[in-house]
């Protein structure tokens, strides 16, 4: 699977449906544009998003786990890694390991400090928006943490 | 498959006005952020605008700024790039570009619309 | 901005061997917080819109074939084909997705 491969609704948000050529947004957006105010600093913007999309994308990539145990044996057929899948693909390369081993670096394997820290940091800056929710939503289920653990536990990064 | 088709190039005198259109298609448009990017002729790439899949986030390049729009709307599945006080500098193919999950980085592209600046 | 300046600007290399395109980048693009680094491949064919190729500067994109390998980290990247084929004449571009877009000027490959 490719990176637009992801299930869509988790980044999905409400929008207006207005026309843009009578979209007050877009009016709004004229005024700010012109007043010289609109244009606040897009390199912040990605600060904010980087962790969030990394989260997303160990979610993405764990989506996938239930296709992966099903097809446990045609992945043993094809040992040098024939899948497109995000988890195959981040699996064929050095990444995984790499990763991996950063995670565990001097901790127990189940503690995971850094991806708490990443929500947490989220959740301080988005408190009020439903970026937070997302967020505790990723917490609840614990999905990074436990998709490294099953990638831990399976040994999977030694399948190569 | 993804699939974007971008419309309303071509050519227009310098100070003049043109606005472009991305039509998407094969995939839920209002869940990703979107891009304009630029090629001039025999030129390199440069990133003109992005607006995320909510319109609440909206940025341009220094060199659009205060000329360029951004727009969309989600029910037609379609992206805008609104350009006043065009310079012969605009000159160049202007790609529209879907978001990945991955914020700035670019997994599909329409095939281009020429837009050219001159008298 | 972060300024993407590639290397060469255009490379000959014969059907079958290796070759190598560099990519260096003003300042780091390694977001410390995953150890990932923020730069991506892509490819530019003749007529056509660039194509994604790697991401994270050493994940390829699905369907991307296993030719193609990136690697690198914090400023210095690489984009490695192993054994050129016809299909892989193009431009070839590095862009860092860790601030506002940037790409390389672009390196031109060509069969010698």
């Known amino acids: 699977r490719s990176l637009q491969d992801t299930e869509e609704k988790s980044r999905s948000f409400s929008a207006s449906q207005a026309d843009p050529l009578s979209d007050p947004d877009q009016m709004n957006e004229d005024k700010r544009h012109s007043q010289g105010t609109f244009t606040s600093d897009y390199s912040k913007y990605l600060d904010s998003r980087r962790a969030q999309d990394f989260v997303q994308w160990l979610m993405n990539t764990k989506r996938n786990r239930n296709n992966i145990a099903k097809r446990h044996d045609e992945f043993e057929r094809h040992a040098e890694g024939t899948f497109t899948s995000d988890v195959s693909s981040y699996l064929e390369g050095q990444a995984a390991k790499e990763f991996i081993a950063w995670l565990v670096k001097g901790r127990g394997r189940r503690d995971f400090p850094e991806e708490v820290a990443i929500v947490e940091e989220l959740g301080r800056r988005h408190a009020d928006g439903s970026f937070s929710d997302e967020m505790n939503t990723i917490l609840d289920n614990l999905a990074a943490r436990d998709f490294i653990n099953w990638l831990i536990q399976t040994k999977i990064t030694d399948r190569k | 498959q993804v699939q974007l088709v971008e419309s309303g190039g071509g050519v227009v005198q310098p100070g003049r006005s043109l606005r472009l259109s991305c039509a998407a298609s094969?995939?839920?448009?209002?869940?990703?952020?979107m891009h304009w990017v630029r090629q001039a002729p025999v030129k390199g790439l440069e990133w003109v605008a992005f607006?995320?899949?909510?319109?609440?986030?909206?940025y341009y390049a220094d060199s659009v700024k205060g000329r360029f729009t951004i727009s969309r709307d989600n029910s037609k599945n379609t992206l805008y790039l609104q350009m006043n006080s065009l310079t012969a500098e605009d000159t160049a193919v202007y790609y529209c570009a879907k978001e990945s999950i991955l914020a700035a980085l670019f997994d599909s592209w329409g095939q281009g619309t020429l837009v050219t600046v001159s008298s | 901005d972060i300024v993407m300046t590639q290397s060469p600007d255009s490379l000959a290399v014969s059907l079958g061997e290796r070759a190598t395109i560099n990519c260096k980048s003003s300042q780091s693009v390694l977001y410390s917080s995953n150890n990932k680094n923020y730069l991506a491949w892509y490819q530019q064919k003749p007529r056509q819109p660039p194509k994604l190729l790697i991401y994270?500067?050493?994940i390829r994109e699905s369907g991307v074939p296993d030719r193609f390998s990136g690697s690198g980290s914090g400023a210095d990247f690489t984009l490695t084909i192993s054994s050129l084929q016809a299909a892989d004449v193009a431009v070839y571009y590095c862009?860092?997705?860790?601030?506002?877009?940037?790409f390389g000027q672009g390196t031109k490959l060509e069969i010698k």
């Open positions: 862009q860092q997705f860790y601030s506002v877009p940037t």
């Open positions: 094969g995939f839920t448009f209002s869940s990703y952020g």
């Open positions: 994270w500067a050493s």
């Open positions: 607006i995320s899949n909510d319109k609440s986030n909206k």
